[in-house]
């Protein structure tokens, strides 16, 4: 609450996060033309990346394009990309939607469709829907430990969200344990009024707000965090503005002296930890 | 504008960026002693990295040191690094400019020059100039979509830079489309009075400032972003302070049971999105 | 100092860091059942990662789990994880401390101990102590160059911490060279009253605070940074809250058509650069 006689100072903050959990993923795997059900285990090294303190990312879904090589091939026949003759294909043209540079030739993509040939990582990425339900939907049960160190330099005051008295096997709950800083990902979504299973398909951005309203006067000292949660990406966003949250990354390797890559389109939740508040002192 | 009767509050912000574009790179490739012209395609997975929201990086140039192995070899004969006898080489010494630890021996680097032998990733990186023009100079035509969600918690007000009425095929223009949040990288540089082609060689840091000056009073409500651009690295910087923007990363692999790496010195533009402003309410 | 007649504005900041240094690492390496002393060189591409401006990470220690494959194996017999019969193992159960999903069978881990079988990356990671002393303890002698560009948009004022008059071979010292922006990592720890050698074992978080107290009035203009250092992680933290600073990442590869990975648990120092301050003008 506003105490007008106090000198207010904004918080200086540092955050450290630690995600825990394992996901079992079942998906169709094609090898040598044969498709069978594959099971795999994903642990933190597989689904998260060494990110900065104020953000962490949990992969909840993915689409893989394996064994890509730099060569010429027909581009993917997405809407409006088909051709019937070379006239439709412009040598040197880079369509922002496409994944390569056109050679000027119209070539067969499959039995029925022809598309412009491109110089690209081939075969080009298929524009297929993200798997539904999400492959790592069980990430809902992962937990994240959030450590937050704050400082009011003008008041020479430092504290942190984890106190020595806290129990490391707690789980945050708005009513029963509002000071616990271990959060179940599914609970974060529930608190924000969002459906984890749904968001996990396309990905999204979730804000974890940590509000410090600190009274640093000795006679009525109070300085503890208050946690709240809100979705930061626009779930009603138009297709053209890229809804959800995803990015592409590649694993490069050599096979028979040929440079290849596996392209992964990773969908997931980026959690942004937004720390704010003030310290006031007479 | 300052309304002194209003209660002002700083903005809490979250940013999400999405880069689009393909570059065709032509460079000399040496294989088995034969040098020929190589063409390759770079897409987002090749030239950008999964970074946090407030920053994104676009590689515009690079120097590769392929097939490095941990062993002994002569260090690169940069200025002042040559020797004529072992006396000039100090066992265990690590010159900050060097890439290894000296063994104490002065050995031939080539026909005419001798340098201190080092324990290092060999052959050591050649200190050659960044290619000019930059290999991915066509990155000038890449575009970036910037999504910005802002919050004034004290006023319980949230909004974003992308409105439902916006057109996903727009391109930002200061006069004709100042609310479009899709930016052509070359335009950003032009607005900042900088030459993309020049900066792309050594790399640099570009600031995209998003200023929210929000009047949240219902009778004169206004809350839209204003974009501006300025170069953040010092183009006149002394050599000793590492001008431009680059970093080294490695791709590790095994060949004939020998651990090897390809070292990439990546030059590029780091774009920092700096969101600031206040929300005022009576 | 507070000048009440001035209009104050918070700083908008961008940071760029560059770490320099080489470490020689000596460790026991086991190959083909034979253990011998291995020496290796780590340079910036090996011990640091391309991170955002406000944070950089230096790996000071690590534990490797090489040649992991997705299959079934006994889990690591940490405290409380041993079993004597299948009744103790619950099919489908994921213990947050474990690295896999239980199959329901109790199987031999070694001659004397049995643990629950798991579907996981096998063999599962051994929960061994971080090496002491830290493998890259010589990182104490690494240096970091910090470039900081600041802006007070309301006052239309921009400056940076590195001035044209500065000497690129300086090293920061609180008394002798307080404006030099090249810092020896060991000195940062010493200034913060911490022991680098000790922290390097488990890792930690170190804050580098850059305080700009700028008087922008022409008649008494002053705008230079003041550097200070403080440890941000809690060194007295309970085991259950994961003391220190570490993260796991993996290097994936194929061997005889089998997907494998090397898991690296990287301990190190995350340096957070916390820039704050105000610009005041009449």
């Amino acid at each position: 609450s506003d105490k007008l006689y106090q000198r207010k100072e904004p918080v200086i903050s540092s955050v450290h996060t630690k995600v825990k959990g394992i996901a079992e993923v079942t998906e169709n795997v094609t090898e040598g033309g044969v498709t069978k059900l594959g099971h795999s285990i994903f642990d933190t090294a597989d689904y998260t990346f060494p990110l900065q303190g104020n953000s962490f990312f949990v992969m909840t879904n993915y689409v893989k394009s394996e064994g890509q090589v730099q060569t010429l091939c027909p581009e993917y026949p997405r809407r409006g990309a088909q051709c019937s003759s070379d006239r439709r294909c412009k040598k040197g043209w880079m369509d922002p939607q496409s994944k390569g540079i056109q050679t000027g030739r119209c070539v067969p993509y499959d039995k029925t469709r022809k598309t412009c040939e491109v110089s690209a990582w081939c075969p080009t990425e298929e524009e297929k829907e993200a798997p539904r339900p999400a492959l790592l939907r069980s990430a809902e049960n992962f937990t994240v430990l959030i450590k937050n160190n704050i400082h009011f330099p003008g008041h020479n005051y430092t504290t942190r969200n984890i106190l020595p008295t806290m129990n490391g096997s707690c789980t945050f709950h708005k009513t029963w344990d509002p000071q616990c800083s271990i959060f179940r990902l599914g609970d974060i979504f529930q608190e924000a009024g969002e459906n984890f299973t749904e968001v996990a398909v396309q990905g999204g951005i979730m804000g974890i707000e940590i509000y410090w309203d600190c009274n640093l006067d000795s006679w009525s000292h109070h300085c503890r965090p208050r946690y709240s949660f809100r979705r930061l990406d626009d779930k009603n966003m138009d297709e053209s503005f890229v809804p959800g949250y995803n990015f592409r990354y590649a694993k490069y390797y050599k096979e028979n002296n040929v440079e290849k890559r596996t392209l992964i389109k990773a969908f997931g939740i980026r959690f942004d930890i937004l720390v704010f508040g003030t310290g006031g002192k007479f | 504008s300052d309304k002194l009767y209003q209660r002002k509050e700083p903005v809490i912000s979250s940013v999400h960026t999405k880069v689009k574009g393909i570059a065709e790179v032509t460079e000399n490739v040496t294989e088995g002693g034969v040098t020929k012209l190589g063409h390759s395609i770079f897409d987002t997975a090749d030239y950008t990295f999964p970074l946090q929201g407030n920053s994104f990086f676009v590689m515009t140039n690079y120097v590769k040191s392929e097939g490095q192995v941990q062993t002994l070899c002569p260090e690169y004969p940069r200025r002042g690094a040559q020797c004529s006898s072992d006396r000039r080489c100090k066992k265990g010494w690590m010159d900050p400019q060097s890439k290894g630890i000296q063994t104490g021996r002065c050995v031939p680097y080539d026909k005419t020059r001798k340098t201190c032998e080092v324990s290092a990733w060999c052959p050591t990186e050649e200190e050659k100039e960044a290619p000019r023009p930059a290999l991915l100079r066509s990155a000038e035509n890449f575009t970036v979509l910037i999504k910005n969600n802002i919050h004034f918690p004290g006023h319980n007000y949230t909004t974003r830079n992308i409105l439902p009425t916006m057109n996903g095929s727009c391109t930002f223009h200061k006069t004709w489309d100042p609310q479009c949040s899709i930016f052509r990288l070359g335009d950003i540089f032009q607005e900042a009075g900088e030459n993309f082609t020049e900066v792309a060689v050594q790399g640099g840091i570009m600031g995209i400032e998003i200023y929210w000056d929000c009047n949240l009073d219902s009778w004169s409500h206004h809350c839209r972003p204003r974009y501006s651009f300025r170069r953040l690295d010092d183009k006149n910087m002394d050599e000793s302070f590492v001008p431009g923007y680059n970093f080294r990363y490695a791709k590790y692999y095994k060949e004939n049971n020998v651990e090897k790496r390809t070292l990439i010195k990546a030059f590029g533009i780091r774009f920092d999105i700096l969101v600031f402003g206040t929300g005022g309410k009576f | 100092s507070d000048k009440l007649y001035q209009r104050k504005e918070p700083v908008i900041s961008s940071v760029h860091t560059k770490v320099k240094g080489i470490a020689e690492v000596t460790e026991n390496v086991t190959e083909g059942g034979v253990t011998k002393l291995g020496h290796s060189i780590f340079d910036t591409a090996d011990y640091t990662f391309p991170l955002q401006g406000n944070s950089f990470f230096v790996m000071t220690n690590y534990v490797k789990s090489e040649g992991q494959v997705q299959t079934l194996c006994p889990e690591y017999p940490r405290r409380g994880a041993q079993c004597s019969s299948d009744r103790r193992c619950k099919k489908g159960w994921m213990d947050p401390q474990s690295k896999g999903i239980q199959t329901g069978r109790c199987v031999p881990y070694d001659k004397t101990r049995k643990t629950c079988e798991v579907s996981a990356w096998c063999p599962t990671e051994e929960e061994k102590e971080a090496p002491r002393p830290a493998l890259l303890r010589s990182a104490e002698n690494f240096t970091v160059l910090i470039k900081n560009n600041i802006h007070f948009p309301g006052h239309n004022y921009t400056t940076r911490n590195i001035l044209p008059t500065m000497n690129g071979s300086c090293t920061f010292h609180k008394t002798w060279d307080p404006q030099c922006s090249i810092f020896r990592l060991g000195d940062i720890f010493q200034e913060a009253g911490e022991n680098f050698t000790e922290v390097a074992v488990q890792g930690g978080i170190m804050g580098i605070e850059i305080y700009w107290d700028c008087n922008l009035d022409s008649w008494s203009h002053h705008c230079r940074p003041r550097y200070s250092f403080r440890r941000l992680d809690d060194k007295n933290m309970d085991e259950s809250f994961v003391p220190g600073y570490n993260f796991r990442y993996a290097k994936y590869y194929k061997e005889n058509n089998v997907e494998k990975r090397t898991l690296i648990k990287a301990f190190g120092i995350r340096f957070d650069i916390l820039v704050f301050g105000t610009g005041g003008k009449f």
Epitope: - | T71, P74, R105, P108, Y109, E117, C122, P123, V258 | -
Partner: nanobody
Framework: EVQLVESGGGLVQAGGSLRLSCAAP?????MGWFRQAPGKEREFVAG????????RYADSVKGRFTISRDNAKNTVSLQMSGLKPEDTAIYYC???????????WGQGTQVTVSS
């Protein structure tokens, strides 16, 4: 282009010995030997850094072959003993920047091991 001249190849019985020599026109940090058997790729055999430090051998020849260098004469030798029929190949001398990295190769000398 560096001209490397090999000598010492020939026909030898299994279990026998042979010594290959190679001269380089100028000093170089590392010198080594490669071989190529009919229908196979060229493979590394042995390498030596300046003054014989370090040395490196392929697993298949360890304990049987010894590489030695004379820096003053810019020469390298390969003493081969305990030869096997599978050692039959054209042997190439090479020079380079480390015992793992070679840039220049000679014309080769034939070694045939009969059973």
């Amino acid at each position: 282009e560096v001209q490397l001249v090999e000598s010492g190849g020939g026909l030898v019985q299994a279990g026998g010995s042979l010594r290959l020599s190679c001269a380089a026109p100028e000093r170089t940090y590392s010198m080594g030997w490669f071989r190529q058997a009919p229908g196979k790729e060229r493979e590394f055999v042995a390498g030596s850094g300046w003054d014989g430090i370090p040395t490196r051998y392929a697993d298949s020849v360890k304990g049987r072959f010894t590489i030695s260098r004379d820096n003053a004469k810019n020469t390298v030798s390969l003493q081969m003993s305990g030869l096997k029929p599978e050692d039959t190949a054209i042997y190439y001398c090479a020079t380079g920047t480390s015992v793992y990295h070679y840039q220049y190769w000679g014309q080769g000398t034939q070694v045939t091991v009969s059973s």
